[in-house]
């Protein structure tokens, strides 16, 4: 064996955004014939020696960063990429609006605005069908998400969440959906 064992993958099914009290399964996947899996919750000292963690009802305490590794013989693999498991529905939903409006011409500009009654400093915007949040490289965490030079690919259903940087894995419920129409 030359070099460390390759890292496994860690995924949350059906999603890493989990409404409170809903089920989720974390699955660590390495190569065939693994002797031992270790799944750990970072910053909590917790671990389990299983590839699969089934959570029947999501709780606030289970939100956070997870990582897994596997052992073959006496060798340990590199760790998986960290998985951020987020509990949603912890706070009331924000409202999502489009300025100047939800119908925009191709090539035009639109700004999606996420607003909340709470003093949250973090916001995440998701487009239905995309696993990762929409992040403007410099200002994604703000309440405004400018989309410059809109194309047909931007059309779809959007939702936003609000949360605090002090508890980055405890999110609001999703906003009501906003349909962006590109003409």
């Amino acid at each position: 064996q030359s070099g460390p064992l390759p890292k496994p993958s860690l995924q949350a099914l059906p999603s890493s955004l989990v409404p409170l009290e809903k089920p989720v399964t974390l699955r660590c996947q390495g190569p065939p014939g693994v002797d031992l899996y270790r799944l750990e919750k970072l910053s909590s000292s917790r671990y389990q020696d299983q590839a699969v963690l089934f959570i029947p009802a999501m709780k606030r305490s289970l939100a956070g960063r997870y990582r897994c590794s596997y052992q073959n013989g006496s060798l340990w693999s590199l760790p998986s990429d960290q998985l951020e498991l987020v509990a949603t529905g912890v706070f009331a939903k924000p409202s999502l609006s489009a300025q100047p409006g939800p119908a925009v011409s191709s090539g035009g500009d639109v700004t999606l605005q996420c607003q909340t009654r709470y003093g949250f400093d973090q916001f995440a915007l998701y487009k239905e069908g995309d696993p990762a949040p929409y992040k403007n490289p410099e200002r994604w965490y703000r309440a405004s998400f400018p989309i410059i030079t809109v194309t047909a690919a931007h059309s779809g259903t959007y939702r936003c969440y609000s949360f605090s940087s002090r508890d980055p894995y405890l999110w609001s419920a999703p906003s009501d959906p906003l349909e962006l129409v590109v003409t």
Partner: antibody, heavy 123, light 112 residues
Framework: QVQLVESGGGLVKPGGSLRLSCAAS????????VSWIRQAPGKGLEWVSA????????QYAESVKGRFTISRDNAKNSLYLQMNSLRAEDTAVYYC????????????????WGQGTLVTVSS | QSVLTQPPSVSGAPGQRVTISCTGS?????????VHWYQQLPGTAPKLLIY???NRPSGVPDRFSGSKSGTSASLAITGLQAEDEADYYC???????????FGGGTKLTVLG
């Protein structure tokens, strides 16, 4: 209440072997990870080896790998450390320690320790 | 050579506050692993003092507190008492080979 009692220590010549035991009581032994941790005279603590509840998950410090073997007998609530090819630097008090556990999770710290058994390797 | 680095000794007068540092690296404390502290009174086995960086087991006085930041941690003892004279060890976990790691220990002397 939780109790861990080590035994089997003694004087052994370099290259010799020794088997340490740790008798556990007051908890459901087979549900817990347990470790051996040693302390050379006047020195600090050094983790030696750990074993999972079923006995299938085992880990060793680099300093003892290939020479020491950890095992357990859950029916007898006992933990063992078979030490072969002993060296002078293995001289230490050997403690067995239980890892904290809660629900399905094990934790990376030790909530109960035995009083230790002294192993002296000398010619 | 211990994986985690502690000062060999600290001292303080009764009633004073002392702190003990514990420095690790990006593969242990900095890799998201918590720090735990043990107290070893002379001639006895170690006893869990602080777990999960800052939590006290029942029976441990609130004069003992812990914190963690980045790749290091510290243990603070306020209102120092003669019975606090002991060796103190920090402990964490290391991601490389999934081994448990300790600091070299710090001898606390209560003066006077």
């Amino acid at each position: 209440q939780v109790q861990l009692v080590e035994s089997g220590g003694g004087l052994v010549k370099p290259g010799g072997s020794l088997r340490l035991s740790c008798a556990a009581s007051g908890f459901s032994f087979g549900d817990y990870y347990v470790s051996w941790i040693r302390q050379a005279p006047g020195k600090g603590l050094e983790w030696v080896s750990a074993i999972g509840g079923s006995g299938s998950a085992v880990q060793y410090a680099e300093s003892v790998k290939g020479r020491f073997t950890i095992s357990r007998d859950n029916a007898k609530n006992s933990l063992y450390l078979q030490m072969n090819s002993l060296r002078a630097e293995d001289t230490a008090v050997y403690y067995c320690a239980r890892h904290y556990r809660e629900f399905r999770w094990h934790y990376y710290y030790f909530d109960y320790w035995g009083q230790g058994t002294l192993v002296t390797v000398s010619s | 050579q211990s994986v985690l680095t502690q000062p060999p000794s600290v001292s303080g007068a009764p009633g004073q506050r002392v702190t003990i540092s514990c420095t690790g690296s990006s593969s242990n404390i900095g890799a998201g692993y918590d720090v735990h502290w043990y107290q070893q009174l002379p001639g006895t086995a170690p006893k869990l003092l602080i777990y999960g960086n800052s939590n006290r087991p029942s029976g441990v006085p609130d004069r003992f507190s812990g914190s963690k930041s980045g790749t290091s941690a510290s243990l603070a003892i306020t209102g120092l008492q003669a019975e606090d004279e002991a060796d103190y060890y920090c402990q964490s976990h290391d991601l490389g080979a999934h081994v448990w790691v300790f600091g070299g220990g710090t001898k606390l002397t209560v003066l006077g």
